[in-house]
C-alpha cells in the first residue's frame, strides 16, 4: 500500500519515464539532409515526456538505455520510382555534441517505400538525434506513415 | 526489503504492465478487411495480460501510452506475385468507439512480402484497435510469420 | 522519498530490467546458418546487462515477457542481388535447450536489402536465442546496420 | 488544379547554355517539390535535379556543376539553368511537381496529405553542332 502511494506521488520523471513521439513537420533547407520533427498533442498523436525538440531535432534529458525506432514512407512512390531513384538512405544518430557524433541506426529503401525499424541504445543527457534522408525522394508528412519516437528503457 | 516486499504483493495489473502478443485466427468475411486475433498460452506463444480480445479485435483495459507492434506476412507471395497484386496495405487504427477513430500505423507491402513495424501512442481504456488488410492477397498463420502486439509503457 | 531511496539501493537486476544489444561479429562456419554476435562498451554501443553469450548465442537469465528485436542488413546488395539470391531467409528462435525449440520470428528478403522486426515473447531462464541465416548472401558487419537485442518487459 | 507550363528548350552548339522554365498555375501553396527530368530517344524518363519547398536542390550526377535549378516563389517558376551542354544531353525535358494537398478527415479531425505527381507536356533540348 505504502509503495502503491508513494508511487502515485512521485512524477513520472523522477521514474525516468522519458518518451518521446513525434511527427514529420519539414524537410531540410539547402544541402540539409535532416529531417525536422514536431510533437505535441495539438498536432495529433506526438507527445513529449521529458526529451525536448531543438530545432526540429530531438535532445535527450536522462541518461540511460533508449529504445528507438522509426518508420519512414516516401511521398510519391512505387517500386520502380524507387528502384529509379535508388540510393535513398535514411540514417538515424547522435549529430552533437559533436564528441559523442555517431550512427545507431541505417537503412536503404532499395525497392520498396517505407522502412521501419527499431533499436536499443545508450543515451546520455544532451544528445540530440538527427534523422538524415539522402536522396531525390521526399518522405510521407501522414502521421501514419512517417513517426519517430524514443522510449527510456533503464539506466 | 520494504520495497522489493511490496513490489511482490501487489499484483503487476496495478504497476500497469498491460501487455499481449497475438497470432492470426482467421481473415474477415467478404466484404471486411479487419484481421482476426487470438491468444492465449494454448495457442502457442501469445498472451493476453491486461487488454482482452472483443470479437477477434484488440481491447485496452489501461489509459496510458503504448509500444504497438506488428509484422504481417503474406502466405503464397514473392516479389512478382506481391507487385502483381499490389497495392496490398496493412492499417492498425483505432476503429472504436467511433468516436476516436484513427490511423495508427500504415504500410503497403510492394515488391516484399512481409512488413513490419511499430509505433508509440496514447491509448484508452476501451479503444479497440483494429488491422485492416485491404488487397487480394492473404496473409500467413505462422506464429513466426504474422503476429501483432501491444505494451504499455507509461501513463 | 522512502521509495525513492528504496529504488536507488535495490540492485537494477533485482527490478528485472535485463537487456541486451549485440553487433555481429561472424557469420558461422560451413553448414552452420547461425549468426554469432558479440557485445560490450569496448566493442561500441552494444551491451549486456543481464542476459549472457554462450559461444556468440544469447542466453537469457531472467524468466519474463521479453521484447526481442532484430535488424539485418546484406553486406554487397541491390534489389537485383537479393532477388537473384533469393530466398535469403534469417529466422530467430529458442535453439536450446532441445526441448524448448521454437520458431520465435522468420523474414525474408525478397527484393530488399534489409529486414527489421520486433516481437513479444516469453522467455525462460537459460533459453539461449539463435539467429539463422540461410541462403548465400552474407550479413554486413557495420554496427548501424546488423544488430539484436532483448529487451524484459514484465514477469 | 495546378498547371504547368514549360519554355525554353531548342537547339544549341556543344559548350553552349540554355535557360528552361517552367510555371505553374493553381494551387500553388500545395507544392512539395519541383523537378525536371530528362527522356532521351528510346530511354525511360530520368531525373535530372529537383527542388523542394524548404529549397532543398538535387541533382543527378551527369549534371553536377554544369546545370542549376532556382525557384521564384513570387512568379511560381521554376528554372533549371544548363551550361556547358554536351550531345548526350539531347533529350525531352519535363516539368514535374509533386503537390501535397491536405484534409481534414475522421471524428478526432485528423489532418491527412495526399501525394500528386503533375507533369508538363516537355520541351526538347538538342545539343549539336
Known amino acids: 500500500q505504502r509503495f502503491a502511494q508513494a508511487q502515485q506521488q512521485l512524477p513520472l520523471e523522477s521514474l525516468g519515464w522519458d518518451v518521446a513521439e513525434l511527427q514529420l513537420n519539414h524537410t531540410g533547407p539547402q544541402q540539409d539532409p535532416r529531417l525536422y520533427w514536431q510533437g505535441g498533442p495539438a498536432l495529433g498523436r506526438s507527445f513529449l515526456h521529458g526529451p525536448e525538440l531543438d530545432k526540429g531535432q530531438l535532445r535527450i534529458h536522462r541518461d540511460g538505455i533508449y529504445m528507438v525506432h522509426i518508420q519512414v514512407t516516401l511521398a510519391i512512390c512505387s517500386s520502380t520510382t524507387a528502384s529509379r531513384h535508388h540510393p535513398t538512405t535514411l540514417a538515424v544518430g547522435i549529430c552533437s555534441p559533436a564528441s559523442r557524433s555517431i550512427s545507431l541506426l541505417r537503412l536503404s529503401f532499395h525497392q520498396g517505400c517505407t522502412i521501419a525499424s527499431q533499436r536499443l541504445t545508450p543515451l546520455a543527457r544532451g544528445d540530440t538525434l538527427c534523422t538524415n534522408l539522402t536522396g531525390t525522394l521526399l518522405p510521407s508528412r501522414n502521421t501514419d506513415e512517417t513517426f519517430f519516437g524514443v522510449q527510456w528503457v533503464r539506466p | 526489503q520494504r520495497f522489493a516486499q511490496a513490489q511482490q504483493q501487489l499484483p503487476l495489473e496495478s504497476l500497469g504492465w498491460d501487455v499481449a502478443e497475438l497470432q492470426l485466427n482467421h481473415t474477415g468475411p467478404q466484404q471486411d478487411p479487419r484481421l482476426y486475433w487470438q491468444g492465449g498460452p494454448a495457442l502457442g506463444r501469445s498472451f493476453l495480460h491486461g487488454p482482452e480480445l472483443d470479437k477477434g479485435q484488440l481491447r485496452i483495459h489501461r489509459d496510458g501510452i503504448y509500444m504497438v507492434h506488428i509484422q504481417v506476412t503474406l502466405a503464397i507471395c514473392s516479389s512478382t506475385t506481391a507487385s502483381r497484386h499490389h497495392p496490398t496495405t496493412l492499417a492498425v487504427g483505432i476503429c472504436s468507439p467511433a468516436s476516436r477513430s484513427i490511423s495508427l500505423l500504415r504500410l503497403s507491402f510492394h515488391q516484399g512480402c512481409t512488413i513490419a513495424s511499430q509505433r508509440l501512442t496514447p491509448l484508452a481504456r476501451g479503444d479497440t484497435l483494429c488491422t485492416n488488410l485491404t488487397g487480394t492477397l492473404l496473409p500467413s498463420r505462422n506464429t513466426d510469420e504474422t503476429f501483432f502486439g501491444v505494451q504499455w509503457v507509461r501513463p | 522519498q522512502r521509495f525513492a531511496q528504496a529504488q536507488q539501493q535495490l540492485p537494477l537486476e533485482s527490478l528485472g530490467w535485463d537487456v541486451a544489444e549485440l553487433q555481429l561479429n561472424h557469420t558461422g562456419p560451413q553448414q552452420d546458418p547461425r549468426l554469432y554476435w558479440q557485445g560490450g562498451p569496448a566493442l561500441g554501443r552494444s551491451f549486456l546487462h543481464g542476459p549472457e553469450l554462450d559461444k556468440g548465442q544469447l542466453r537469457i537469465h531472467r524468466d519474463g515477457i521479453y521484447m526481442v528485436h532484430i535488424q539485418v542488413t546484406l553486406a554487397i546488395c541491390s534489389s537485383t542481388t537479393a532477388s537473384r539470391h533469393h530466398p535469403t531467409t534469417l529466422a530467430v528462435g529458442i535453439c536450446s535447450p532441445a526441448s524448448r525449440s521454437i520458431s520465435l520470428l522468420r523474414l525474408s528478403f525478397h527484393q530488399g536489402c534489409t529486414i527489421a522486426s520486433q516481437r513479444l515473447t516469453p522467455l525462460a531462464r537459460g533459453d539461449t536465442l539463435c539467429t539463422n541465416l540461410t541462403g548465400t548472401l552474407l550479413p554486413s558487419r557495420n554496427t548501424d546496420e546488423t544488430f539484436f537485442g532483448v529487451q524484459w518487459v514484465r514477469p | 488544379q495546378l498547371q504547368l507550363v514549360e519554355s525554353g528548350g531548342g537547339l544549341v552548339q556543344p559548350g553552349g547554355s540554355l535557360r528552361l522554365s517552367c510555371a505553374a498555375s493553381g494551387n500553388i501553396f500545395s507544392i512539395y517539390a519541383m523537378a525536371w527530368y530528362q527522356q532521351a530517344p528510346g530511354k525511360q524518363r530520368e531525373l535530372v535535379a529537383q527542388i523542394t519547398n524548404a529549397g532543398s536542390t538535387n541533382y543527378a550526377d551527369s549534371v553536377k556543376g554544369r546545370f542549376t535549378i532556382s525557384r521564384d516563389n513570387a512568379k511560381n517558376t521554376v528554372y533549371l539553368q544548363m551550361n556547358s551542354l554536351k550531345p548526350e544531353d539531347t533529350a525531352v525535358y519535363y516539368c514535374?511537381?509533386?503537390?501535397?494537398?491536405?484534409?481534414?478527415?475522421?471524428?478526432?479531425?485528423?489532418?491527412?496529405?495526399?501525394?500528386?505527381?503533375?507533369w508538363g507536356q516537355g520541351t526538347l533540348v538538342t545539343v549539336s553542332s
Open positions: 514535374n511537381v509533386l503537390h501535397e494537398s491536405t484534409e481534414v478527415a475522421g471524428p478526432v479531425g485528423e489532418k491527412r496529405y495526399t501525394y500528386q505527381e503533375i
